[in-house]
């Protein structure tokens, strides 16, 4: 049941009125409107779309809608000097060149300003050398190459397949291995689902399709030239040599037709096992270099992209709260796309647009939410979450005092199988309760709840009869709010069947083929999954903004803290001798978790029983709930990652997309057996245990009775 209570201004409006106003047909119309031309960050087209959204949000009835601009470092290919990779013979002649562009889809042949595939922020360069195939270029892949196979990547160009981990981590790993360049490609094993046709006849990646994307390792910094501060008119900017997170070697992405031509000639060592082989008809030899007849041929990269400070624009809409206007619930998603953005981001932006329209309709009828709702259309997400991060840096003091929750709204779909939710444990119960009230759009679940279909298709690995909710990682605009500022955050979208579809992301991700037609023909012809996602995202925002008592359950944090403590303890216990030698104990952490559990339980009882009509008491209890996420922030941040400050969760150091629990301890323990100075290494483990213990205990104490 909705925990919302109508404000005293308009008793007739509740969440049902808001949800009933959401229409699939409108989302479809908005998606079509947003996807007719490219909206690359920093371009005139994306500025015009920002102004259009500003104008429409005003029409929909928001109190105010402003554009906020920042001047950030972006990266573009050189229009007159295209990027490509060649195979050169012993005379230096180019005997094969990779494609300069993706063949445009039917109907889009005359669209201008389609940016060719490139790796954003790649430095310029023309490295030349032998190729080494490095599988997914994960940490463990380089361990296998260097430690087991004794293959040295120093001075080599590496070719890695996309998938499994964020591309920036692949590039970082290649750099550390001494590579002089990186070629990224989409292997059909990861981006071609069996039995489905290539676009335009299906949703699979054609051989000429290429995934664009940034290759930064920002670790939450935002604009590389202004870490920690907004990139405004008076900002001090670092020189390029001191910029945060830029790769130091040239990088370029290609499709599988081009990859075939490079990989079919590979010689050297055979691949170590089947997990290194994709679906191309090539040997998947590791190298280095080409086989027999072709051993004198080399690979050469030609990269001429430039990085330039460019203006970007966020759209920020405000719907003022009637009772607690100084408490902010934020719904944000990005607007910039690599090309047409059929899924990423416009399937999300269209949903936000319809949510704004529905809230605006209620407001025009006299209703207001209890708390202020902020709506955001972020720019330059694709270039490193820049728009959201700069805005949060500019408004950090307000956000850390007033931010109740952030709901992310990038792509609404990455499949059409079931719901996928990642969020803070504080929101688990909100999500469960909401999905029990919503109707499932899935075939075979007519008349059943979304909770039921979600639980059936994506069961929790720990709790029977409940659906899976995952940890927040990064790679999207919630990062600054959650990982840096400690604002409770969540995201929801429709996803694929992870059991049967092993490919990473969806096949046409960040390609020119991510069009309106892709969504309308293959993913969601009736836009029923989009509507469901709008109901989930919008419903969460409604509850967070309108519930008298914030819909957070601190007991769910207690449960996961115990689970994460067990997990990290078990990792450490793989080294029992060292733990004994260096007196490593997790007792303090388990004690803090126990304290947190007890205090959270008592807090929940008080929350249930207190006098809700006492505004001071109500505000006090709500503040304790709001500030609980904030209590997990360590102002000093994680080692070497100052903008990742959440002690319980951080993006994995090996994959930005994945969340890691107790990341400080986890990283201290990672590969500890290979550390040169074990005493120092185990000392760092102990230090991280103490930081985690202190933080959990301190957070628990924020839930204690105030006096």
């Amino acid at each position: 049941k909705s925990s919302s209570e109508a404000t005293n201004i308009t008793p007739k409006h509740n969440m049902k009125a808001f949800l009933d106003e959401l229409k699939a047909e409108n989302i479809k119309k908005f998606l079509h409107n947003f996807t007719q031309i490219p909206h690359l960050a920093g371009t005139e087209q994306n500025f015009q779309l920002a102004k259009q959204i500003q104008s429409q949000w005003k029409e929909f009835g928001l109190d105010s809608v402003e554009l906020t601009h920042y001047d950030v470092l972006l990266s573009y290919p050189n229009k007159t000097h295209p990027n490509y990779i060649s195979i050169i013979n012993e005379d230096g002649n180019e005997i094969f060149n990779t494609s300069l562009f993706e063949p445009p889809p039917a109907g889009y042949e005359n669209v201008s300003d389609i940016v060719p595939p490139f790796s954003a922020f790649s430095p310029q360069g023309m490295p030349e050398g032998d190729l080494v195939y490095v599988n997914y270029a994960r940490t463990e892949d380089f361990f296998k190459l260097e430690r087991d196979m004794k293959i040295n990547c120093s001075g080599k160009i590496v070719i890695a397949r996309y998938g499994k981990v964020f591309r920036g981590n692949k590039v970082k790993n290649a750099q550390l291995a001494g590579a002089t360049g990186v070629i990224l490609y989409s292997d059909p094993a990861d981006y071609f689902a069996p039995g489905v046709k290539s676009y335009p006849d299906g949703w699979n990646l054609p051989g000429g399709g290429v995934q664009r994307g940034n290759i930064l390792n920002l670790n939450g910094a935002g604009d590389p030239l202004t870490p920690g501060y907004p990139a405004n008119e008076y900002a001090y900017r670092r020189g390029m040599a001191e910029a945060v997170g830029l790769p130091s070697i040239p990088v370029h992405p290609i499709g599988y037709y081009d990859a075939q031509k490079l990989l079919e000639k590979m010689g050297g060592s055979a691949s170590p096992d089947s997990s290194w082989r994709g679906s191309l008809k090539v040997p998947y030899n590791v190298g280095p270099g080409f086989t027999g007849n072709f051993s004198t041929q080399k690979v050469k990269m030609h990269i001429h992209s430039t990085s330039e400070v460019t203006r970007i624009y966020n759209v920020i809409g405000t719907l003022r709260g009637a009772v607690e206007p100084d408490r902010y619930v934020i719904l944000g998603g990005h607007r910039d796309s690599w090309v047409f953005g059929g899924i990423d981001p416009q399937s999300g932006a269209a949903v936000v647009h319809e949510i704004v329209r529905s809230f605006g309709t209620l407001k025009k009828e006299g209703w207001r939410p209890r708390r202020t709702i902020l709506f955001a259309s972020w720019d330059a997400e694709e270039f490193g979450l820049l728009g959201s991060t700069e805005w949060a840096e500019e408004n950090s003091r307000l956000l850390q005092e007033r931010g109740v929750a952030y709901i992310n709204a990038d792509s609404s779909i990455e499949g059409n199988y079931t719901l996928r939710v990642d969020c803070t444990p504080l929101m688990y119960s909100l999500v469960y309760n909401l999905t029990k009230e919503l109707e499932s759009p899935d075939e075979g679940f007519e008349g059943k709840s979304l909770y039921e279909s979600w639980t059936k298709k994506s069961p929790s690995p720990e709790f029977s009869g409940m659906p899976r909710i995952s940890k927040l990682g990064s790679g999207n605009d919630f990062e600054v709010f959650f990982q840096r500022l400690g604002i409770a955050s969540g995201r929801a979208r429709y996803t694929k069947n992870w059991e049967t579809n092993k490919f990473s992301s969806y096949p046409l991700y960040h390609s020119v083929y991510e069009t309106y037609e892709l969504v309308e023909k293959f993913y969601d012809p009736m836009f029923k999954y989009h509507l469901t996602v709008a109901q989930v995202r919008g419903g969460m925002v409604f509850e967070l903004a309108n519930s008298v008592v914030l819909p957070f359950d601190c007991r769910d944090y207690a449960v996961v803290l115990r689970k994460y403590a067990d997990k990290i303890y078990n990792i450490s216990m793989k080294h029992p001798q060292e733990m004994k030698t260096y007196s490593v104990s997790f007792d303090s952490l388990f004690s803090a978790v126990k304290n947190f559990t007890e205090i959270a339980s008592k807090f929940s009882e008080r929350l249930r029983d207190f006098d809700k009509s006492n505004p001071i008491l109500l505000r006090m209890m709500n503040d304790q709930l709001m500030f609980l996420e904030r209590a997990f922030i360590d102002p000093l941040g994680l080692p070497d990652r100052p903008f990742y400050r959440h002690v319980i969760y951080a993006p994995s150091s090996h994959n930005k997309y994945a969340g890691e629990s107790f990341p400080g301890i986890y990283d201290a323990l990672f590969d500890i057996e290979s550390k040169v100075d074990p005493s120092q290494a185990w000392g760092e483990v102990k230090r991280q245990i103490s930081v985690a213990t202190f933080t959990v205990q301190a957070a628990a104490e924020t839930l204690s009775e105030v006096a």
């Epitope: 599988y256 075939q260 031509k261 994709g278 191309l280």
Partner: antibody
Framework: QVQLQQSGAELVEPGASVKLSCKAS????????INWLRQRPEQGLEWIGG????????NYNENFKGKATLTIDKSSTTAYIQLSRLTSEDSAVYFC?????????????WGQGTSVTVSS | DIELTQSPLSLPVILGDQASISCRSS???????????LHWFLQKPGQSPKLLIY???NRFSGVPDRFSGSGSGTDFTLKISRVEAEDLGVYFC????????FGGGTKLEIK
């Protein structure tokens, strides 16, 4: 749509050479190898060899080394086969066929065939 | 080279009946990537061969669903569930896991 258009029938004398062409259209020429095959009357298909338009790399069936030479002209998207020192045994229909890339890896598009008759 | 042996050489059928053609390879056709590159073609009189089935069991675009392929390792089968007049001709199996080779062909004709 993908098309492979082969040159017309040839009548050649024993010991002579002949050059057949295969003009490709409707796809990106450099991505797909071109195979050449021989079919003698009432017999099966024999693979002669293949050429990669991307880099000009060739592969030959051992039985046809010295008999067939494969070349390409990227500018006109045309593949050629030169057959030398012809004998009556070489009388056959010669096909060019595009080597399908992933997911097919089969000869997914064929020319109409060129009939070569070796006779004095 | 890999030898592909087809049987029968000739297959007389009644229209509407099922037809089954076998193709046996002299060695395994499983590629190191795990896929099996065994394909089926139909050649009608005076025409070039047309691809029907690729990688054992996948129908090429435009091929009716009465055609199906199966098998693994060295033994493969093409089935036509209800033979129609337009299906008559010579069927070849072919492999591209190694240097390409073709079976000798099976002539499907009316009984």
């Amino acid at each position: 749509q993908v098309q492979l258009q082969q040159s017309g029938a040839e009548l050649v004398e024993p010991g002579a050479s002949v050059k057949l062409s295969c003009k490709a259209s409707g796809y990106t020429f450099t991505y797909f190898d071109i195979n050449w095959l021989r079919q003698r009357p009432e017999q099966g298909l024999e693979w002669i060899g293949g050429i990669s338009p991307g880099d000009g790399n060739t592969n030959y069936n051992e039985n046809f080394k010295g008999k067939a030479t494969l070349t390409i002209d990227k500018s006109s998207t045309t593949a050629y086969i030169q057959l030398s020192r012809l004998t009556s045994e070489d009388s056959a229909v010669y096909f060019c066929a595009r080597d399908g890339n992933f997911p097919y890896y089969a000869m997914d598009s064929w020319g109409q065939g060129t009939s070569v008759t070796v006779s004095s | 080279d890999i030898e592909l042996t087809q049987s029968p050489l000739s297959l007389p059928v009644i229209l509407g009946d099922q037809a089954s053609i076998s193709c046996r390879s002299s060695q395994s056709l499983v590629h190191s990537n795990g896929n099996t590159y065994l394909h089926w073609f139909l050649q009608k009189p005076g025409q070039s061969p047309k691809l029907l089935i690729y990688t054992v069991s996948n129908r090429f675009s435009g091929v009716p669903d009465r055609f199906s392929g199966s098998g693994s390792g060295t033994d493969f089968t093409l089935k036509i569930s209800r033979v129609e007049a337009e299906d008559l001709g010579v069927y070849f199996c072919s492999q591209s896991t190694h240097v390409p080779t073709f079976g000798g062909g099976t002539k499907l004709e009316i009984k």
